[in-house]
Amino acid sequence: QRFAQAQQQLPLESLGWDVAELQLNHTGPQQDPRLYWQGGPALGRSFLHGPELDKGQLRIHRDGIYMVHIQVTLAICSSTTASRHHPTTLAVGICSPASRSISLLRLSFHQGCTIASQRLTPLARGDTLCTNLTGTLLPSRNTDETFFGVQWVRP
Amino acid sequence: QRFAQAQQQLPLESLGWDVAELQLNHTGPQQDPRLYWQGGPALGRSFLHGPELDKGQLRIHRDGIYMVHIQVTLAICSSTTASRHHPTTLAVGICSPASRSISLLRLSFHQGCTIASQRLTPLARGDTLCTNLTGTLLPSRNTDETFFGVQWVRP
Amino acid sequence: QRFAQAQQQLPLESLGWDVAELQLNHTGPQQDPRLYWQGGPALGRSFLHGPELDKGQLRIHRDGIYMVHIQVTLAICSSTTASRHHPTTLAVGICSPASRSISLLRLSFHQGCTIASQRLTPLARGDTLCTNLTGTLLPSRNTDETFFGVQWVRP
């Protein structure tokens, strides 16, 4: 009984339940392949509990193993469209600090219009995750088609 | 030592570990695009711990942020089949209460025969999730090819 | 305050946070469709906390419900390549003990070069998971393209 009460009184942050789900804000300028994300209840069903956004990129606030997941759908796309354009690839990686730069997750669209995947990976406080989209087809901004999130799993 | 004992004595439900993994039961009648799900150990590896099924649709019993995941495979399908039929799309959303109706996750099959994705989303007690499959190809009922689940992640 | 201290002193294993993320080591010999995995910080971002590797296959050490996820990308692959080869299929299942042998997750590549999915499933201590890749295209060993992992979710 006392344990249950104590547990309820503890701030969630002390349990390490960092979590974020983001929606696409915009693509980068000409030479910048990064997707820029946004999150918060005012925007719909996106949120940040722990991690933060730094110029549209997701910054981790707690060390641990995270489940990283993403779905990106190309706008106005069919398998014909996809085959008639330069191959589109999405890569999720740590882009800063530079010393920890690495690609975590990479997918090509081939003749499809959606990619979706997830993986477990260790992340450290201060790691910034970038999602690079290369190709000439625009990603959909519909919140049920394109999203990116992380979930703290364990220390 | 005492904490570990106390922890073991607490019912899992008080920790909020609601989780469900469902298998396809059947598709809806003519004008109903919904997939109807079933779960329980007697059926194989599907289960419901917390959420419930209401006429084949999944109803949430605990407020929180959930990881929702789904895989649907079309039966008797090849890339040729898929491209020759009307585009098949899967959408997962809150279908009741009507005031909270929203699409959470949407994927098209294009020239593929399987879609799989996952996302984090806030759900509230009483939310019913529906999975709408539009198109003329039948989904596989094989339990390793078509499944739908939720996992409570945090309050 | 005392609870928080006690919590920090508890070994993570007592909380059941078993987790593993593996990278592809090699494919099997001629008649063996299994993929052989490896994990550990020396190899990059792969790890095993609880589960173990037994001859390249993942063995579970704690009963519970697990989230199993996988991504496999075919090497030197385009949609044309994929369509010109024998259909490639990936299946994740319990391969031992033989009494519990079952397919948990199955996907075909069709005209794509990557599959990615995830599901919740009950696993028991001693269950060994195998990932069978059938087809004539080689899987990529890039750690951001091909990976396999499990996460303990609840008892």
Partner: antibody, heavy 119, light 111 residues
């Protein structure tokens, strides 16, 4: 610097064919689709179609489908637009154009090629 | 095909005054979180020049007196303070589906 340089003006008789070239430079040729847009004297702009130089796949405006062919030569980074069965109403300036990053709008244009169809 | 109707056909505005050009699509050109409407300026003897893309994004190097707005079927190009070098024909174009189509053009002159 991205540049699209088109071939010179042409005078053709009705029923003949014309082949206009568009040489690309300043970027990776096979990455970006090249579109063709024409403009009759004193008139507006009309999209004719586009080609993906990576594999040569083309998509045409239905209006021109039976008469237009778009091809490419990756060795010279050149795209060609051939229009057959010419008639007087095909007299126009023909432009090749390229988008900047995402397909759908045109940031780079060739200087235009005037094709005159006259008997 | 989506038909693009521009209005007015021509417009005479004093230097420093606001010029507004409208473009109406025969059906919505908004989807996937974007409005697929773009605006060009064309001067005699020159190819068109991109001004605005995706309804309201200013192309790099274009003066900020140009702006775009609208969604669905109705769109507007605004020149907040007309300059002498803005005398030209302006076209709208959609890329919602193939074939892409252009509006008939609006000729902007100085009053």
């Amino acid at each position: 610097e991205v540049q699209l340089v088109q071939s010179g003006a042409e005078v053709k008789k009705p029923g003949a064919s014309v082949k206009v070239s568009c040489k690309a430079s300043g970027y990776t040729f096979t990455t970006y689709n090249i579109h063709w847009v024409r403009q009759a004297p004193g008139q507006g702009l009309e999209w004719m179609g586009d080609i993906y130089p990576g594999n040569g796949d083309a998509s045409y405006n239905q209006k021109f489908r039976d008469r237009v062919t778009m091809t490419r030569d990756t060795s010279t980074s050149t795209v060609y637009m051939e229009l057959s069965s010419l008639r007087s109403e095909d007299t126009a300036v023909y432009y090749c154009a390229r988008f900047s990053r995402f397909d759908g709008w045109f940031a780079y244009w060739g200087q235009g090629t005037l094709v005159t169809v006259s008997s | 095909d989506i038909v693009m109707t521009q209005s007015p056909d021509s417009l005479a505005v004093s230097l420093g005054e606001r010029a507004t050009i409208n473009c109406r699509a025969s059906r919505s050109v908004s989807t996937s979180g974007y409005s697929y409407m773009h605006w060009y300026q064309q001067k005699p003897g020159q190819p068109p020049k991109l001004l605005i893309y995706l309804a309201d994004n200013l192309e790099s190097g274009v003066p900020d007196r140009f702006s775009g707005s609208g969604s669905g079927t109705d769109f507007t190009l605004t020149i907040s303070s007309l300059q002498a070098e803005d005398v030209a024909v302006y076209y709208c174009q959609h890329s919602r589906e193939l074939p892409y189509t252009f509006g008939g053009g609006t000729k902007v002159e100085i009053k």
